[in-house]
């Protein structure tokens, strides 16, 4: 051994005076002379290029050129390689350590608040985590020991900049302004792209990113790359930030972050970001299912392991709250799956943002920006081919769950593209093949990862999917600071935490309700309505008397038809009253002269055959509502394509007479005739199917007014369409929220545990062109159309100013989980 040592460069690297066995040398020139000792390459050269220790390096003489040190004094000097303790001192590595040793929070002296590390791996789709888990031991360990979701939903469009900035602001792209990687703002008259300096203009970046939220509340923040971190947002940069340079090795990024954690307490940040370009780069180049992606996953896993090992070396591995996530997923694209605009237009006289989430605007901007006829473009792209692989939308008509409309940068024409397809201008575009993203955020291929570990997080837990707008509030809770206003629902991720910091409570009702009292069984004004079936005033009196419920009957109908409580009204100054019926309850909005909501429970019926037809041509005044607050039947005669629909379907009756409880003006809402076809099919066929499958469903439905398409209920003066020129407004959408018991052995009104929700927000349009229904029966298109417009209960709440489930005996944070849940039916990736 002694002889071997004498022939070794160990501790002798670049020492010009050293002469080893057989006169071997370890100086800089030995390679030129050819007299290097046997281990010169491994011990001296390789050591300056690697970020790890090994048996050659342990105890090495400090090398100026090395990236990190394995010398005996490196711990004091704070420049050890991340794995020094495990390789050179025989400690158990983080990877080998048992999860169970991480039971209690272990923060060293000076770490009063557990630091938060937000780590993004671009384009890491959720499926990779399950398919390639054995190739990613470090990430897999984090998944096993910490908490993870089945997936995290990206926001639309599922692109890098919009989603990274959403994660750190809690805002939808329409709210924070970064609506795509490429965009035009007519007010700035500038173009934003990832390749131009313009991206660093603060005018593009709205909202308050996490680093500023932390800094405004006395904490320091450090970003090792993150979209927006090099921009003087609101005039400020993060406390520490790095100018973006994609060629910085991942190990160098990790090493720098670890050095920031070594800073003295007064200088040390509490919040950190880390960004890796992989596996996105490889996914684009070769597609998601490729050797290149597998290699990239191994690379990022190794670098992540270096971080965890470095944390362990500092005894921070059970002190730091680390969140590992992605911005979006990845899908395969093909050069034979291209939609060309030249197939739809004789000439392309518009500008198109091409790809998986295309937008179309005027070519000549700013001059033609506002006068560009978007409606005409959408018309020319609608229902043109039987196998069309995109659906054109005016952005206000996009599914509301996307929240992708209210920003001047979001061009009015939008193409919703099928998975794996691309929509481009012409065949001159050959940017296809490999992988891409940007598609519908419900596609499984677009799902992103979310894993977390640390003293604040629960351990060994898998949670249901959630949306990335919720992460900002979560990080604020981890840092015990107040979030800026955002689109997340604070408290909805409390189930990820051992001890939640924020305790949510139900919203206070803003507008009190009254009860529309029953005074007289005969109306003072028949509102131009007719019901030939009620041939005299005695019959009319009889059916109207049915609307006069006793207190016992009110209690009974509330128990069955409002099992989770009455929706609370959070809009200001809304004069509303409750209307009780044996089979439904509704909240009547006096200013709008229509029900704001109607609630009823459909039991599990014996058979699933469609409902019988409603009594035809029979409508009458509701004697509980003054004529001045009611619609009139005559309103509907003047507007040919507007008819009336019923919120509570009269055909769902339990007795032959009870149908008359629904054939009243207070149950009426204006509907386009084409829309009503879908509405009626839903209630007579699909609703019965749902009730049968779920052991009964509670239904709450009602109108929505969002003419300014901002995702929030409109002020009355913002409403632009009215029936027959009266002040009866025409809704922009209708909502339907189906609620059943998760445990299907219970009915909705006797549900002890979790609820299941299926909310729809259906655009109310004069035609069904969105479904290209020509010559097709409703069975072929209605369900597909409704599924496209599934939303969260929270989306319904924002659009209506109502608040649901307040009387459900369940912790509020669990109710918020329910409200932020988005049902999905995507099965294939």
């Amino acid at each position: 051994r002694k002889l071997e040592k004498q022939g070794s460069c160990r501790k002798k690297c670049f020492d010009a005076s050293f002469r080893g066995l057989e006169n071997c040398r370890c100086d800089v020139a030995c390679e030129d002379r050819g007299d290097c000792c046997w281990d010169f390459e491994d011990t001296c050269v390789e050591s300056t290029r690697i970020w790890t220790c090994n048996k050659f390096r342990c105890g090495e003489t400090r090398l100026e050129a090395s990236l990190c040190s394995c010398s005996d004094d490196c711990l004091q000097r704070k420049d050890c390689c991340a794995d020094y303790k495990s390789v050179c001192q025989g400690e158990t590595s983080w990877l080998e350590e048992n999860c169970d040793t991480a039971q209690q929070s272990q923060c060293p002296e000076g770490f009063d608040l557990p630091p938060v590390i937000l780590f993004s791996m671009d384009g890491f789709r959720a499926e990779y985590l399950y398919t390639w888990d054995t190739l990613m031991p470090n990430i897999n360990k984090l998944k096993t020991c910490g908490i993870h979701s089945k997936y995290m939903r990206a926001m639309y469009p599922t692109k890098t900049f919009p989603n990274h900035y959403t994660i750190v602001t809690g805002l939808y792209p329409e709210s924070h302004g970064i609506i795509d990687n490429n965009m035009y703002d007519v007010n700035l008259n500038k173009n934003f792209s990832l390749s131009s300096e313009e991206q660093n203009n603060p005018a593009w970046w709205h909202g308050q990113p996490m680093w500023l939220t932390a800094m405004y509340q006395g904490l320091k923040a450090a970003t090792y790359f993150w979209p927006g971190s090099e921009v003087a947002i609101n005039g400020s940069f993060p406390s520490i930030y790095m100018p973006y340079n994609r060629s910085v090795p991942y190990e160098e990024r990790i090493s720098t972050l670890l050095k920031w954690l070594d800073l003295p307490k007064a200088e040390r940040p509490s919040f950190y970001t880390m960004y890796f370009e992989e596996p996105d780069s490889s996914g684009h180049a070769s597609g998601p299912v490729s050797a290149r992606v597998i290699k990239a996953l191994q690379v990022v896993d190794h670098a992540f392991g270096m971080l965890m090992e470095g944390l362990k070396q500092r005894n921070l591995h059970n002190c730091v709250n680390i969140i590992l996530l992605a911005d979006h997923g990845m899908d395969q694209t093909y050069c034979n799956k291209m939609e060309y605009m030249t197939d739809y237009f004789p000439r392309i006289n518009f500008y198109m943002y091409e790809g998986p989430a295309p937008r179309i605007r005027a070519l000549n901007v700013p001059h033609d920006f506002f006068s560009f006829n978007s409606e005409e473009i959408v018309r020319n792209l609608s229902c043109r081919k039987p196998d069309q692989h995109f659906k054109p939308y005016l952005t206000p008509d996009l599914p509301k769950r996307l929240h992708y409309a209210k920003n001047v940068r979001i061009d009015k024409v939008h193409l919703f593209v099928d998975p794996q397809w691309l929509a481009v201008g012409s065949k001159s575009n050959t940017n296809c093949g490999g992988g891409n993203h940007g598609y519908n955020n419900e596609f499984r291929s677009m799902e992103a990862i979310f894993l977390a570990h640390g003293p604040s997080f629960k351990e060994k837990t898998e949670v249901e999917p959630f949306e990335n707008i919720e992460v900002y509030n979560l990080m604020c809770d981890l840092l015990r600071i107040q979030p800026a206003p955002n689109n997340g629902t604070r408290g909805s991720l409390n189930h990820l935490l051992k001890v939640p910091f924020y305790k949510p409570s139900h919203a206070e009702e803003v507008s009190k309700f009254s009860v529309c009292g029953f005074a007289n069984p005969l109306p003072t004004d028949n509102l131009s309505c007719l019901c030939p079936h009620l041939q005299n005033s005695i019959q009319l009196e009889q059916v109207n008397q049915m609307l006069n419920l006793t207190q016992e009957e009110i209690t009974a109908t509330v128990k069955v038809n409002l099992p989770f409580g009455r929706p609370r009204v959070l809009q200001k100054n809304v004069d509303n009253c409750l209307l009780y019926h044996r089979e439904y309850v509704s909240g009547f909005g006096k200013a709008m002269r229509m029900p704001m909501w109607s609630s009823y429970t459909v039991p599990q019926l014996g058979d699933t055959s469609p409902l019988p037809p409603t009594v035809p041509d029979c409508l009458r005044a509701d004697v509980r509502v003054p004529p001045s607050e009611s619609q009139k039947c005559s309103f509907y005669l003047a507007d040919e394509n507007i008819t009336h629909g019923f919120l509570y379907p009269p055909a769902i009756n339990r007795t032959s007479d009870s149908q008359y409880d629904a054939l009243i003006m207070s149950n009426l809402v204006p509907m386009y005739e084409e829309f009503r076809k879908m509405w009626d099919y839903f209630h007579s066929v699909l609703l019965i199917k749902h009730a049968t499958e779920r052991n009964g469903v509670n239904v709450v439905s009602g109108p929505i007014f969002d003419y300014n398409y901002d995702g929030h209920f409109d002020a009355p003066e913002e409403i632009t369409k009215h029936i027959a020129n009266t002040d009866i407004p025409i809704p922009t959408h209708y909502f339907v929220v189906l609620t059943s018991c998760k445990n299907k052995s219970h009915t909705p009104e006797n549900c002890p545990g979790w609820l299941d929700v299926l909310p729809f927000i259906i655009p109310h349009r004069p035609t069904n062109v969105e479904s290209c229904p020509e010559g097709k029966p409703e069975a072929l298109w209605v369900e597909e159309r409704l599924t496209a417009h599934i939303a969260r209960v929270r989306d319904v709440e924002l659009l209506t100013g109502l608040d649901f489930y307040q009387d459900k005996a369940q912790p509020v944070s669990e109710i918020l989980q329910l409200k932020t849940y988005l049902p999905t039916f995507e099965t294939t990736i």
Epitope: S374, K412, A591, S628, P716, T720, H722, D727
Partner: antibody, heavy 115, light 107 residues
């Protein structure tokens, strides 16, 4: 038959005030939002103000904001426009019109502003 | 505010001929557009609302089309009583705005 009859026009000095009225009949007044539109001599139409059926909102053109006040009395089927601080450029025929698109108009009342 | 631009300012047409009037909005007004006819000394009269729906009592020779930013009023065969000034107006946004008018005169 729907009828709208304006009154209250006349000659007034700059800085003066006038109150216009519009009497409605032949329809349920409380079902409709109402509007004032004016037309200067030899010029086109200019929207002045709108009020919703139950007065939950009133909207004004920038040119009259802070000077004109629109109101209604549903019990009396009446619409009003209180015009203060009148200017030369306010001289016009003032029409009241029904609904969100103006399906019925009155015959108009002339407001003359001159010193 | 949304600027409504009508063209032409004056249209000279012979009785029995077709007249096509254009109205352009500076930004989309969806289909919330109305057309009015005004004869000298009289109040305007509603012809078309919702861009294409004829108002009560309006003859079938009047038709409206368009949506978004481009709209057209067509009078298929001009009668003597149709010579007047025609205004378009949007009711999609506040403030409500009118076009400057197109005068249809006898050729």
């Amino acid at each position: 038959e729907v009828q709208l009859v304006e009154s209250g026009g006349g000659r007034v000095k700059p800085g003066g005030s006038l109150r216009l009225s519009c009497a409605a009949s032949g329809f349920t007044f409380s079902d409709y939002s109402m509007n004032w539109v004016r037309q200067a001599p030899g010029k086109g139409l200019e929207w002045v103000s709108s009020i919703s059926s139950i007065s939950s909102y009133v909207k004004y053109a920038d040119s009259v904001k802070g000077r004109f006040t629109m109101s209604r009395d549903n019990a009396k089927n009446s619409l009003f426009l209180q015009m203060n601080s009148l200017r030369d450029e306010d001289m016009a025929v003032y029409y009241c019109a029904r609904g969100h698109y103006f399906d019925y108009w009155g015959q108009g009342t002339l407001v003359t502003v001159s010193s | 505010e949304i600027v409504m631009t009508q063209s032409p300012a004056t249209l000279s047409v012979s009785p029995g001929e077709r007249a096509t009037l254009s109205c352009r909005a500076s930004q989309s007004v969806s289909s919330n557009l109305a057309w009015y006819q005004q004869k000298p000394g009289l109040a305007p009269r509603l012809l078309i609302y919702g861009a294409s729906t004829r108002a009560t009592g309006i003859p079938a020779r009047f038709s409206g089309s368009g949506s978004g930013t481009e709209f057209t009023l067509t009078i298929s065969s001009l009668q003597s009583e149709d010579f007047a000034v025609y205004y378009c107006q949007q009711y999609n946004n506040w403030p409500r705005t009118f076009g400057q008018g197109t005068k249809v005169e006898i050729k």
